[in-house]
């Protein structure tokens, strides 16, 4: 049976049986989610012309998707491990409602969308174990999330396609920045 993260299997002496380090696990986790996003983006781009939309059209959205900024301490200049880790966790928690929205947006990649969502939950757990300052992490309000979800689902088809595209693009960018930052920690 699989060995739960952070535990050892019966063969304690065998070096390979030592569990993956926290960094190894997080790295694999993010790379896997990025791979899943790539599959979802492929279906989205094949289904609609959103991927060819101009930057101006993309900018005209009222989604409040998490984004890395200089002040978050995740970039090479002004890098701050603790501030950055808080930003990554907070951002991932904020993305969860958008990942929930994606669940009914795919036909051939429905299982892949679920895998991305579940893998993100596991990633959040790993990162929370790594963080020292959990008090600084703000969890999104469930009521606000529920009304946001309802609002997104009530959009017309074109806006729903645009929203799906924007979520996937932003989540990919956020994870790529997170991966670069976490590799410095």
């Amino acid at each position: 049976a699989p060995v739960p993260p952070g535990e050892d299997s019966k063969d304690v002496a065998a070096p390979h049986r030592q569990p993956l380090t926290s960094s190894e696990r997080i790295d694999k986790q993010i790379r896997y989610i990025l791979d899943g996003i790539s599959a979802l983006r492929k279906e989205t781009c094949n289904k609609s012309n959103m991927c060819e939309s101009s930057k101006e059209a993309l900018a005209e959205n009222n989604l409040n998707l998490p984004k890395m900024a200089e002040k978050d301490g995740c970039f090479q200049s002004g890098f701050n491990e603790e501030t950055c880790l808080v930003k990554i966790i907070t951002g991932l928690l904020e993305f969860e409602v958008y990942l929930e929205y994606l669940q009914n947006r795919f036909e051939s990649s429905e299982e892949q969308a679920r895998a991305v969502q579940m893998s993100t939950k596991v990633l959040i757990q790993f990162l929370q174990k790594k963080a020292k300052n959990l008090d600084a992490i703000t969890t999104p309000d469930p009521t606000t999330n529920a009304s946001l979800l309802t609002k997104l689902q009530a959009q017309n088809q074109w806006l729903q396609d645009m929203t799906t595209h924007l979520i996937l693009r932003s989540f990919k960018e956020f994870l790529q920045s997170s991966l670069r930052a976490l590799r410095q920690m």
Partner: nanobody
Framework: AVQLVESGGGLVQPGGSLRLSCAAS????????MGWYRQAPGKQRELVAD???????NYADSVKGRFTISRDNTKNTVYLQMNSLKPDDTAVYYC???????????WGQGTQVTVSS
Amino acid sequence: AVQLVESGGGLVQPGGSLRLSCAASGSISRFNIMGWYRQAPGKQRELVADITNRGTTNYADSVKGRFTISRDNTKNTVYLQMNSLKPDDTAVYYCHTYYPTTGFDDWGQGTQVTVSS
């Protein structure tokens, strides 16, 4: 329970080639990353290469251009084609499967690769 069985290890001369195989038996989630780690005596375990169920690959810098990882999802098998082998590649190679939707993983027992003249 999932069992990972490696094969293909052995003794090879510098510059030679080997192909490792790892077959997973049992109930395996199709959302996974299969890969290879290695451990040389007195050294830290290191990732050699891995591949997602969609075929996206990742390699250690030390093996890029020499090693190729591939997989057959229908057989739950991962392969490592090792070319231009160097004495530094001598190690026990372990097959590893990681399940991102749960965070669990499985290990094989390992296969010895020795590169020596």
